[in-house]
């Protein structure tokens, strides 16, 4: 029987910052019970604090609520491992909640084929950013990035559309079925999960440019 | 305990290029954003670029307008920096140096000393 | 590039005595979040750098007392309230609001 072993931090998420949470990985257990506290203060501050949600982000998580969470303080954060052979420390960590936000994935995507008389036709797409993002007051800059398959194949293709919401591409393949999804990142934080697949049918008399390249 | 082991010192011809690795070690690779900084002899620090090596992300200084290239390996939870078409005045230590989830650098590496030379 | 100014460029102190390094940028450190991202940090001889102050005036973990750092929009100030034989080194300052990230050219604390 042994003190545990040192636990770690290992990923801090915000959806919003507006919330966040952080997941810690337990050290070894050294054969006894172990209980697990996360204690932080915030920049500028010496007073230490507890996690004030153990609860929402499941297993080995501390969730921090709108009330607990601020954009402009770094919050300096460590987990405690302790049974009843002694106690244990992660590293300090750091988290500034702008450089952890993975926002949801963007929604609406819609996408049509669209055929003008006087131009070659192209697939034209337009989606929305999650609802919970905030982009009025210009705290988040959103970034796109479209991949897009003909059903059966193995690779996709990915286009960055910078911070617009909407996407033209103009080399595909007549007569294929194709799967598109879009995700969106912040300027300093993570990559959004794909968006749920959407599906078009290209028509068999849809031209095929002569350059694989996409207009914005 | 945090370690950031970087690969030696290298010698090499102008025009060819350089390859710099960064072994990471004491917390989980994914999580972290990792940056390359560099520094000229006697000269100041030079924010190269950074990679996340959770999705392979990278954002580079356009000063070195692709000459630069940053790569990671999950398995090995190692780090690389690569620059081409080198020149003598990239002559330098080059450091890896890793964040916790803010902008500033928590961690760096030992440094690798790159000698550009005919 | 948001270019950073340090002065000056060596400083030779007496133990016990107090030194202060100026930093200017060329455009201010506010970021759209409102944080102010300048940070201070030390290179010892023959070492990496660390880090002593983040965020204008936020002492690193383990960094002592002596250490402060103040400042504002684009004028900054490290200072050390009593030198001592261990901060020698150079100290150099950089801004990560805007990228590319950029650092100032060193100021290079000696010994009397």
């Known amino acids: 029987q042994l003190p545990p072993g040192k636990p770690e931090i290992f990923k801090c998420r915000s959806p919003n910052k507006e919330t966040f949470t952080c997941w810690w990985r337990p050290g070894t257990d050294g054969g006894l019970p172990t209980n697990y506290s996360l204690t932080y203060h915030r920049e500028g501050e010496t007073l230490m604090h507890e996690c004030p949600d153990y609860i929402t982000g499941g297993p080995n998580s501390c969730h921090f609520g709108k009330q607990y969470t601020s954009m402009w303080r770094t919050y300096v954060m460590m987990v405690n491992a302790t049974n009843q052979m002694g106690s244990s420390f992660s590293d300090e960590l750091y988290v500034d909640v702008t450089y952890i936000v993975q926002p949801d994935p963007p929604l609406e995507l819609t996408v049509e084929v669209k055929q003008p008389e006087d131009r070659k036709p192209y697939l034209w797409m337009k989606w929305s950013p999650p609802t919970l993002i905030d982009l009025k007051t210009g705290w988040f800059t959103l970034l796109y990035e479209i991949r897009l398959k003909p059903e059966k194949a193995a690779e996709w293709e990915t286009h960055f559309a910078g911070q617009q919401t909407e996407f033209k591409i103009l080399s595909l393949h007549p007569g294929q079925k194709y799967l598109v999804q879009v995700r969106c990142k912040p300027d300093h934080g993570y990559w959004s999960a794909w968006s749920p697949a959407t599906f078009i049918q290209i028509p068999s008399d849809f031209i095929m440019n002569d350059h694989h390249h996409h207009h914005h | 305990e945090v370690q950031l082991v970087q690969s030696g010192a290298e010698v090499k011809k102008p025009g060819s290029s350089v390859k710099v690795s960064c072994k990471a070690s004491?917390?989980?690779?994914?999580?972290?954003?990792m940056h390359w900084v560099r520094q000229a002899p006697g000269q100041g620090l030079e924010w190269m670029g950074v990679i996340d090596p959770s999705d392979t992300y990278t954002n580079y200084n356009q000063k070195f307008k692709g000459r630069v290239t940053i790569t990671a390996d999950e398995s090995t939870s190692t780090a690389y920096m690569e620059l081409s078409s080198l020149r003598s005045e990239d002559t330098a230590v080059y450091y890896c140096a890793r964040g916790d989830y803010s902008n500033w650098f928590t961690y760096w590496g030992q440094g690798t000393l790159v000698t550009v030379s005919s | 590039d948001v270019v950073m100014t340090q002065t000056p460029l060596s400083l030779s102190v007496t133990p016990g005595q107090p030194a202060s390094i100026s930093c200017r940028s060329s455009q201010r450190l506010v970021h759209s979040n409102g944080n102010t991202y300048l940070h201070w940090y030390l290179q010892k001889p023959g070492q990496s750098p660390q880090l002593l102050i983040y965020k204008v005036s936020n002492r690193f973990s383990g960094v002592p007392d002596r250490f402060s750092g103040s400042g504002s929009g684009t004028d900054f100030t490290l200072k050390i309230s009593r030198v001592e034989a261990e901060d020698v080194g150079v100290y150099y300052c950089?801004?990560?609001?805007?990228?590319?990230?950029?650092f100032g050219g060193g100021t290079k604390v000696e010994i009397k």
């Open positions: 004491g917390y989980t690779f994914t999580s972290f954003w």
């Open positions: 950089s801004q990560s609001t805007h990228v590319p990230w950029t």
